[in-house]
C-alpha cells in the first residue's frame, strides 16, 4: 500500500526505512532490524523471484540518484507460518548479501518487547512510498502520516489504525513498511479493506510485537552461524 | 438472512426535512460501512453518502453536501439520514445498502423508499 494524505518525511528522518525493488522500481517497504537483516510483509515476496530483489537503505527521494544509499541482494529468506487467505503472519524476514554500514542514514529500527500490545487511542506514525492516492503514481518522496490505533473491527491478530475526519491511509507500495507507535517498530503494512484510504475500515498491520521472539532467534542465529550451514539451500532460499 | 428495510420517506415541500432510517439485520452491523443511494424517475443510480464502520469518518455526493447528514445507531442496527432544505431534485427512491470491504461494491439493499419533493 501507499500513503494516502500523508506529508513528506523530513530526508532520513527514519533510517531504518527500506525499499525493495525489482528492476529499479518500489514494489514494497521494510524495515532495517540489524545491519544484515530486513523485515517486510510476506505477501510483498510470495509471488517475486526474491533472487531479483534489490534491498535499497539510505533512500528518501526515489526518482534521485543518492549517495546515501546502500544496495543488497537478498541472501535467505525466513517466513513464519504466513496464511495468505486469512491473511495471518504476514511477516517476513530477509537476510542480506552483506551487513549495512550504519550511520546518519541507515540505522537498525527498534522493536518493542514481545506481546506488547497497543491500547486504543495510541498515535502512530505510517510511512512508505506507496501511492498517493486513486488514479495518482507513486510517491517519489517517502511519505508519512499521523494515524491512531483503533481495536474495534480488528483481529488480535493485527493492529489496526485509522485517520478520523479525512480520507487518508495506506496503499498499495506501502505494504511491508513500518509503523511507529512511541519510536518502536509495531506494525508491517498488511491490507487495506473498503479501498486505499477510503476511511471506512482501520487499515491493518502485521504486530511485530508478537514475533519479537522469532525475530530475535533469527538475527541471533546468524551471529552465532555468521556462514550459512552447509546443508542449507542455495543462495535467497526459504525457511519457516 | 441479511435484511435491509427503508422507511420514513414521503411526500415534502421544498425547503423541508425529512429523516430516512434503515432497519438492518442479518449481519454484524457493526461491522460494515454504510450507504446511502437513489434512483430519481427515469434516472440512473447515485451514489447519496457513506458513513464508516465506527462512524467517524462519513462522506457526501457534492449534490447533498451541507444539506444531508448519515449517522448510524448500532445499538439498533440502524442507519439514518437526515435530509434538510429537500428540492425537486432530490425526488427519488432511496436505498440503503450494505458495503462489501474487499471489493468497493455493494452486496445487499434494501426495497427502498420513495421521497417526493413537491410544491
Known amino acids: 500500500s501507499e500513503i494516502v494524505g500523508g506529508r513528506r518525511a523530513r530526508p532520513h528522518a527514519w533510517p531504518f526505512m527500506v525499499s525493495l525493488q525489482l528492476r529499479g522500481g518500489h514494489f514494497c517497504g521494510a524495515t532495517l532490524i540489524a545491519p544484515n537483516f530486513v523485515m517486510s510483509a510476506a505477501h510483498c515476496v510470495a509471488n517475486v523471484n526474491v533472487r531479483a530483489v534489490r534491498v535499497v537503505l539510505g533512500a528518501h527521494n526515489l526518482s534521485r540518484r543518492e549517495p546515501t544509499r546502500q544496495v543488497f541482494a537478498v541472501q535467505r529468506i525466513f517466513e513464519n507460518g504466513y496464511d495468505p487467505v486469512n491473511l495471518l503472519n504476514d511477516i517476513v524476514i530477509l537476510q542480506l548479501n552483506g551487513s549495512a554500514t550504519i550511520n546518519a542514514n541507515v540505522q537498525v529500527a527498534q522493536l518493542p518487547a514481545q506481546g506488547r500490545r497497543l491500547g486504543n487511542g495510541v498515535q502512530c506514525l505510517a510511512m512508505g512510498w506507496g501511492l498517493l492516492g486513486r488514479n495518482r503514481g507513486i510517491a517519489s518522496v517517502l511519505q508519512e502520516l499521523n494515524v491512531t490505533v483503533v481495536t474495534s473491527l480488528c483481529r488480535r491478530s493485527n493492529v489496526c489504525t485509522l485517520v478520523r475526519g479525512r480520507q487518508a491511509g495506506v496503499c498499495f507500495g506501502d505494504s511491508g513498511s513500518p509503523l511507529v507507535c512511541n519510536g518502536l517498530i509495531h506494525g508491517i503494512a498488511s491490507f487495506v479493506r473498503g479501498g486505499c484510504a477510503s476511511g471506512l475500515y482501520p487499515d491493518a498491520f502485521a504486530p511485530v510485537a508478537q514475533f519479537v521472539n522469532w525475530i530475535d532467534s533469527i538475527i541471533q542465529r546468524s551471529e552465532d552461524n555468521p556462514c550459512p550451514h552447509p546443508r542449507d539451500p542455495d543462495p535467497a532460499s526459504r525457511t519457516h | 438472512e441479511v435484511q435491509l428495510v427503508e422507511s420514513g420517506g414521503g411526500v415534502v415541500q421544498p425547503g423541508r426535512s425529512l429523516r430516512l432510517s434503515c432497519a438492518a439485520s442479518g449481519f454484524t452491523f457493526s461491522n460494515y460501512a454504510m450507504h446511502w443511494v437513489r434512483q430519481a424517475p427515469g434516472k440512473g443510480l447515485e451514489w447519496v453518502a457513506v458513513i464508516s464502520y465506527d462512524g467517524s469518518n462519513k462522506y457526501y455526493a457534492d449534490s447533498v453536501k451541507g444539506r444531508f447528514t448519515i449517522s448510524r445507531d448500532d445499538s439498533t442496527n440502524t442507519l439514518y439520514l437526515q435530509m434538510n432544505n429537500l428540492r425537486a431534485e432530490d425526488t427519488a427512491v432511496y436505498y440503503c445498502?450494505?458495503?462489501?470491504?474487499?471489493?468497493?461494491?455493494?452486496?445487499?439493499w434494501g426495497q427502498g423508499t420513495l421521497v417526493t419533493v413537491s410544491s
Open positions: 445498502a450494505k458495503d462489501l470491504p474487499w471489493e468497493w461494491e455493494l452486496d445487499y
